[in-house]
């Protein structure tokens, strides 16, 4: 996890001090580096990325996505509905995160920095949204079945979900990432 | 024409308050961050505070703080920068300045106003 | 916070000439920009994320760089070009900003 202190954000009057804007900044650039190394070895592995069969395998998952109502856009955006969205989302993300563990042979170290990565992220932007409404977390009887109900699936299945998870991460921290930027 | 007009410079005795508006055109207001940035004279470039869009996070330069507040009125789409016990070296030309959508970058700024702290 | 150090701190060059600005942290950044400031007038972005391209900026201005040292290039220098030029980075707050460099004409 990249280290970046920052002791100069201050909160407006009615919010705590902050955590670091530059660690967010460093800690999503970092997971996205680690999703790039790990789809390099989906891609390599199968031909999933050219694949026009998402859809199958869509079915099945009910990844988190950044909608026009998230307030995450530069159309419409809302900082506190946002920053709300983020981390609902990324707790989302995390039981498939823990479905790519046992998904990888030679970025089996990079698939834990990412799920470990990912959870000081969640740290970093609960305390930003200190003062925010409540964010419900996921239930986990629902996710650990969920996980169950993925690894019970066919092979093909299995890496056609590990490439959706990838690029439906990647493409939910770039949009945080530009979001976040002006917060 | 997207633009930025800064207002509410002057003289002010050391001591003193002044509050500077930026008065934003030609774009949406909403979605952006702004941002003030001061520059003494003949001196280079000194960033002073940033507000985030909808006004819940600030962020201010170790000069500044617990001097200035940064504040917004998103309803007439203008920054203010209110400046409290001013002091000789808070003299500058104080810019506005827009940041860039998904960036950190400053990419439009105001013509400035000129702030002189003096006896 | 970040110090910014630009060399030159001023240069004299003709029109056509390559100018070449760098500007060196002391610990490394984040994010690197570049800025051109003409006498009266307020800051224009140039560069954004060490080597982007503001919107409306001539081609023959670059960014290059990464960690602590950044170069801004004009490739051909013509005479609108004559101004002082800033780096200013993000690494967190405060932004900070280079000395500056002053492009006069020989």
């Known amino acids: 996890v990249p280290p970046g202190e920052d002791s100069k954000d201050v909160a407006a009057p009615h919010r705590q001090p902050l955590t670091s804007s530059e660690r967010i900044d460093k800690q999503i650039r970092y997971i996205l580096d680690g999703i790039s190394a790990l789809r390099k070895e989906t891609c390599n592995k199968s031909n999933m990325c050219e694949s026009s069969k998402e859809a199958l395998a869509e079915n099945n998952l009910n990844l988190p996505k950044m909608a026009e109502k998230d307030g995450c856009f530069q159309s419409g955006f809302n900082e506190e509905t946002c920053l709300v969205k983020i981390i609902t989302g990324l707790l989302e993300f995390e039981v498939y995160l823990e479905y790519l563990q046992n998904r990888f042979e030679s970025s089996e170290e990079q698939a834990r920095a990412v799920q470990m990565s990912t959870k000081v992220l969640i740290q970093f932007l609960q305390k930003k949204a200190k003062n925010l409404d409540a964010i419900t977390t996921p239930d986990p009887t629902t996710n650990a079945s969920l996980l169950t109900k993925l690894q019970a699936q066919n092979q093909w299945l299995q890496d056609m979900t590990t490439h959706l998870i990838l690029r439906s991460f990647k493409e939910f921290l770039q949009s945080s990432l530009r979001a976040l930027r002006q917060m | 024409e997207v633009q930025l007009v800064e207002s509410g410079g002057g003289l002010v005795q050391p001591g003193g308050s002044l509050r500077l508006s930026c008065a934003a055109s030609g774009f949406t207001f909403s979605p952006f961050a702004m941002q003030w940035v001061r520059q003494a004279p003949g001196k280079g470039l000194e960033w002073v505070a940033k507000i985030s869009p909808g006004g819940s996070w600030t962020y201010y330069s170790d000069t500044v703080t617990g001097r200035f507040t940064f504040s917004l009125d998103t309803s007439k789409s203008t920054a203010y920068l209110q400046m409290n016990s001013l002091r000789a070296e808070d003299t500058a030309v104080y810019y506005c300045?827009?940041?860039?959508?998904?960036?950190?970058?400053?990419?439009?700024w105001g013509q400035g106003t000129l702030v002189t702290v003096s006896s | 916070d970040i110090q910014l150090t630009q060399s030159p701190s001023s240069l004299s060059a003709s029109v056509g000439d390559r100018v070449t600005i760098t500007c060196s942290a002391s610990i490394s950044v984040s994010y690197m920009y570049w800025y051109q400031q003409k006498p009266g007038k307020a800051p224009k972005l140039l560069i954004y994320d060490m080597s982007n391209l503001a919107s409306g900026v001539p081609s023959r201005f670059s960014g290059s760089g990464s960690g602590t040292d950044f170069t801004l290039t004009i490739s051909s220098l013509q005479p609108e070009d004559f101004a002082t030029y800033y780096c200013m980075q993000w690494s967190g707050y405060p932004y900070t900003f280079g000395q500056g460099t002053k492009v006069e004409i020989k």
């Open positions: 300045a827009r940041q860039l959508w998904g960036y950190y970058a400053l990419d439009i």
